[in-house]
């Protein structure tokens, strides 16, 4: 007869490992007992369990409650055992020693491989600001056994770099994604993809990019200068800009305080019926945590009684 086993048994952390050992004997041969031991190189054999044909399974103190016989039906020539709830420390070499009658003793070895699936983590880099050079957008770390694969899935243009740290029974892989920040990247997803033989499917962690910027400011509302005449109602100036984080707006008058009746509503400056008092230089101040911009305009309210044309100077400063 001969023993049938596997060279390698692979199991995911926490699952039960079946350690196979089947005696393929000639007719009339019987298995008396099967002794299982752990036999890692450099260490003495550590008994796991003894499976007796008549008296069942007796488990060593170190494996109490963790070694069982496979569920029925059982073949009397089958010396396989179940190792419950495999942990990383179980990884190693195992030997089954089969005592048969009348053929004598046989032994076979197998290697138990315990896959430790990674639990990846994604850490965003420092705040991204337009105008920076190559900057760390995010790093993704995953530790497992064997070493996991860490890649990136994104439409954003960038560069990646990886490094690996080996531990006694596992390896940690860290991948970094660098980019040159631009406002077009705002809101774009950056996904870390972790692959591992212990995972049924890739694990994905998505980070949404936020790039701080502030666009140039401009003022709208003076396109048709002839509309700015005494008595006109509903006249308004609107400050145009965009940014991340969204900017706040502030209106001032360069040559004095804002006239009474003028309403500030965020990016909009609303005028009461126009009078010559409303003529002056108005400044829109746009700011966010990243930067600030100014844009100023000169308002010249026309008196229809006068023949002289209205002149408007539009100056933008930042």
């Amino acid at each position: 007869g001969e023993l049938e086993t596997s060279d390698v048994v692979t199991v995911v952390l926490g699952q039960d490992a079946k350690l196979p050992c089947f005696y393929r004997g000639d007719s009339g041969e019987q298995v008396g007992q099967v002794a299982w031991a752990r036999v890692d190189a450099g260490e003495g054999a550590q008994e796991l369990a003894l499976l007796h044909s008549k008296y069942g399974l007796h488990v060593s103190p170190a494996y109490e409650g963790r070694v069982e016989q496979p569920p029925p039906p059982r073949n009397p020539l089958d010396g396989s055992v179940l190792l419950r709830n495999a942990v990383q420390a179980d990884e190693g070499e195992y030997e089954c020693r089969v005592s048969t009658f009348p053929a004598g003793s046989f032994q076979a070895r197998l290697r138990l491989r315990v896959l430790v699936p990674p639990l990846p983590s994604l850490n965003p880099g420092p705040a991204l600001e337009e105008g920076q050079g190559l900057t760390l957008a995010a790093s993704c770390t995953a530790e497992g056994s064997p070493a996991p694969s860490v890649t990136w899935d994104t439409e954003v243009k960038g560069t990646t770099s990886s490094r690996s740290f080996k531990h006694s029974r596992s390896a940690a892989v860290t991948s970094e994604f660098h980019l040159v920040p631009s406002r077009s990247m705002n809101g774009q997803p950056l996904t870390c993809v972790v692959s591992h033989p212990g995972l049924l499917q890739d694990q994905r962690i998505t980070h949404i990019l936020h790039v701080s910027f502030l666009a140039e400011a401009s003022v709208r509302g003076l396109e048709d200068q002839n509309l700015w005449h005494i008595g006109r109602e509903g006249a308004m100036l609107k400050c145009l800009s965009e940014g991340q984080p969204p900017p706040s707006y502030n209106w001032t008058r360069l040559d004095g305080p804002l006239p009474s009746g003028v309403r500030v509503d965020g990016d909009t400056l609303g005028f009461p019926p126009l009078t010559t008092e409303h003529s002056g230089i108005y400044v829109c101040h746009v700011s966010n945590e990243f930067s600030s911009r100014d844009s100023q305009v000169t308002v010249d309210v026309l008196d229809p009684q006068e023949d002289s044309g209205k002149q408007v100077d539009l100056v933008s400063a930042s």
Epitope: A35, G44, Q46, L50, H52, S60, P61, A62, E64
Partner: antibody, heavy 122, light 110 residues
Framework: QVQLVQSGAEVKKPGASVKVSCKAS????????IHWVRQAPGQGLEWMGI????????SSAQKFQGRVTMTRDTSTSTVYMELSSLRSEDTAVYYC???????????????WGQGTLVTVSS | QSVLTQPPSVSEAPRQRVTISCSGS????????VNWYQQLPGKAPKLLIY???LLPSGVSDRFSGSKSGTSASLAISGLQSEDEADYYC???????????FGGGTKLTVL
């Protein structure tokens, strides 16, 4: 060689407690269960309980539950058996015994301590 | 009273054969291995037979064990004076969840 060495004889008063030690050597201490068996003078053997030397988990005969405490110290490969609320009928030789036969995980005691005589007398 | 039943004593002449019986139930002998121990006067017990009929190394093959149903027996052939001792059978008991012993049999070599 494989051996179990027990502590010396004790004389105790009724109601007291006794703690007997059993030091193992010559084998991997945590690989085999240790049992305690006692023998009253002129009487037969009586199983008291079992301890798992790696986890410290114990199980004792119903007769002794609540009175017997088995512990172990893996750093010194020593097992202890403490019997409380002693009475005169607890006078006996107390043995520790290693389970297994020639390194195999068999339910038999192949190595015994030399025994510790505990006398309970007022 | 012991869970396993043995005769209190047996005696036989040197060079003869003697058998010691041990009777139990389905929860012990019927379902578990039987071990036999020899205890010389003033000494700790010594394993003589394990798993019904197996001899540990160093034990004379004059000793043999057997089991049938809920009974077991120890046979000693070619009796010698140094065989004078107490003999105990033992087995795990599934109901009591512990080991049980016979009351012991005193062997006298006449």
């Amino acid at each position: 060689q494989v051996q179990l060495v027990q502590s010396g004889a004790e004389v105790k008063k009724p109601g007291a407690s006794v703690k007997v030690s059993c030091k193992a050597s010559g084998y991997t201490f945590t690989s085999y269960y240790i049992h305690w068996v006692r023998q009253a003078p002129g009487q037969g053997l009586e199983w008291m309980g079992i301890i798992n030397p790696i986890s410290g988990r114990t199980s004792s005969a119903q007769k002794f539950q609540g009175r017997v405490t088995m512990t172990r110290d893996t750093s010194t490969s020593t097992v202890y058996m403490e019997l409380s609320s002693l009475r005169s009928e607890d006078t006996a030789v107390y043995y520790c015994a290693k389970e297994g036969v020639g390194g195999e995980l068999l339910r038999a005691f192949d190595i015994w301590g030399q025994g510790t005589l505990v006398t309970v007398s007022s | 009273q012991s869970v396993l039943t043995q005769p209190p004593s047996v005696s036989e002449a040197p060079r003869q054969r003697v058998t010691i019986s041990c009777s139990g139930s389905s929860s012990n002998i019927g379902n578990n291995a039987v071990n036999w121990y020899q205890q010389l006067p003033g000494k700790a017990p010594k394993l003589l037979i394990y798993y019904d009929d197996l001899l540990p190394s160093g034990v004379s093959d004059r000793f043999s064990g057997s089991k049938s149903g809920t009974s077991a027996s120890l046979a000693i052939s070619g009796l010698q004076s140094e065989d004078e001792a107490d003999y105990y059978c033992a087995a795990w008991d599934d109901s009591l969840n512990g080991f049980v012993f016979g009351g012991g049999t005193k062997l006298t070599v006449l």
